[in-house]
Interface confidence: medium
């Protein structure tokens, strides 16, 4: 069954490199026979030299957000990291309640786009702490 850590599937609400979606050491996912590198590749050389002649499109494997096309960030998804859309106004985001709580996540979201911040949705103030919904809202 799904691990409880999956309840919070986002990265910190900060752009890379601060948000943990920029291929920092330790941010690679390791499942199955993926050990410390993404899919068994050398993180430092093979992927960056072989795969990133062009900017990655949505869903493409990446190491850091600079590998992705404009409007995308590099975030954890399943067993790898892929280029995902930067969040738009009204889209669900996740704010971590304590430092380091994003470390075990399998699914991450991008950060909110320019001029937006991840804030609790107004009609969810009464909800329990664990189920409060955050969305990208204008500053």
């Amino acid at each position: 069954t799904l691990n409880s850590v999956l309840n919070s599937n986002a990265i910190k609400n900060l752009p890379p490199p601060l948000g943990g979606a920029a291929g920092h050491p330790g941010s690679a996912v390791s499942f199955g026979n993926d050990h410390s590198t993404l899919d068994g590749y050398s993180r430092r050389t093979t992927l960056s030299s072989k795969m990133y002649h062009t900017k990655g499109q949505e869903g493409s494997v990446c190491l850091r957000s600079s590998d992705c096309a404009s409007g995308l960030c590099c975030a954890r998804h399943f067993w790898s990291k892929i280029c995902k859309p930067v969040l738009k106004e009204g889209q669900v985001c996740t704010k971590h309640r304590r430092k380091g709580s994003h470390g075990l996540e399998i699914f991450q979201r991008c950060y909110c786009g320019e001029g937006l911040s991840c804030r609790i949705q107004k009609d969810h103030h009464q909800a329990s702490n664990s189920s409060r919904l955050h969305t990208c809202q204008r500053h």
């Epitope: 069954t1 309840n7 990655g56």
Partner: antibody, heavy 116, light 112 residues
Framework: QVQLVESGGGLVQPGGSLRLSCAAS????????MSWVRQAPGKGLEWVSG????????HYADSVKGRFTISRDNSKNTLYLQMNSLRAEDTAVYYC?????????WGQGTLVTVSS | DIALTQPASVSGSPGQSITISCTGT?????????VSWYQQHPGKAPKLMIH???NRPSGVSNRFSGSKSGNTASLTISGLQAEDEADYYC???????????FGGGTKLTVLG
């Protein structure tokens, strides 16, 4: 545009084998995880298997584990599913799907019929 | 194991809004809100309509929206059109082992 074309389906006897292929075009095949999903006649979707972009990491549904093998040839932009020890309950349309933001592109499917 | 439950069928008239539910246990849809929705017309391949619970891929009409409350994810189709008649599947992920899990599917009928 993204295109996935399955082939290799057909009629096979119980206990037999079949190898499905999926030819991919319109995207950088080696940058994406890929999957096989099947659908029995008149039934819902069932995920069969997934493979990482290099092919070193594979995952299977319990119902096919030990009988099916997923693989890929990135130089040929082709995904494969080797199906052994086939059973009547494996009868289905088999779709290959790109695992981008979830299963974001699908082929049209190839029908596998297991019957004596 | 994860199980996602959908109604077998829903119907609506053109122009109306309908909602299809997908209910799971706290360890799948509720505790883990990464849910996707697929549309499948008869004899055709499925098409991704919503990912991450509420996000539409490019090219998908804004008449389609997704949400989640507690253990139930929902797909809402507004301004129902004849071409919306299809089967709809919700899908989530289990990670031990890693597998995709689909709901049983919901047949949407557009009346009239």
């Amino acid at each position: 545009q993204v295109q996935l074309v399955e082939s290799g389906g057909g009629l096979v006897q119980p206990g037999g084998s079949l190898r499905l292929s999926c030819a991919a075009s319109g995207f950088t095949f080696s940058s994406y995880w890929m999957s096989w999903v099947r659908q029995a006649p008149g039934k819902g979707l069932e995920w069969v298997s997934g493979i990482s972009y290099s092919g070193s990491n594979t995952h299977y549904a319990d119902s096919v584990k030990g009988r099916f093998t997923i693989s890929r040839d990135n130089s040929k932009n082709t995904l494969y599913l080797q199906m052994n020890s086939l059973r009547a309950e494996d009868t289905a349309v088999y779709y290959c799907a790109r695992m981008g933001i979830d299963l974001d592109y699908w082929g049209q499917g190839t029908l596998v019929t297991v019957s004596s | 194991d994860i199980a996602l439950t959908q109604p077998a069928s829903v119907s609506g008239s053109p122009g109306q809004s309908i909602t299809i539910s997908c209910t799971g246990t706290s360890s799948d849809v509720g505790g883990f809100n990464y849910v996707s929705w697929y549309q499948q017309h008869p004899g055709k391949a499925p098409k991704l309509m919503i990912h991450d619970g509420s996000n539409r891929p490019s090219g998908v009409s804004n008449r389609f929206s997704g949400s989640k409350s507690g253990n139930t994810a929902s797909l809402t189709i507004s301004g129902l059109q004849a071409e919306d008649e299809a089967d709809y599947y919700c899908q989530s992920w289990d990670v031990s082992p890693i597998t995709a899990v689909f709901g049983g599917g919901t047949k949407l009928t557009v009346l009239g």
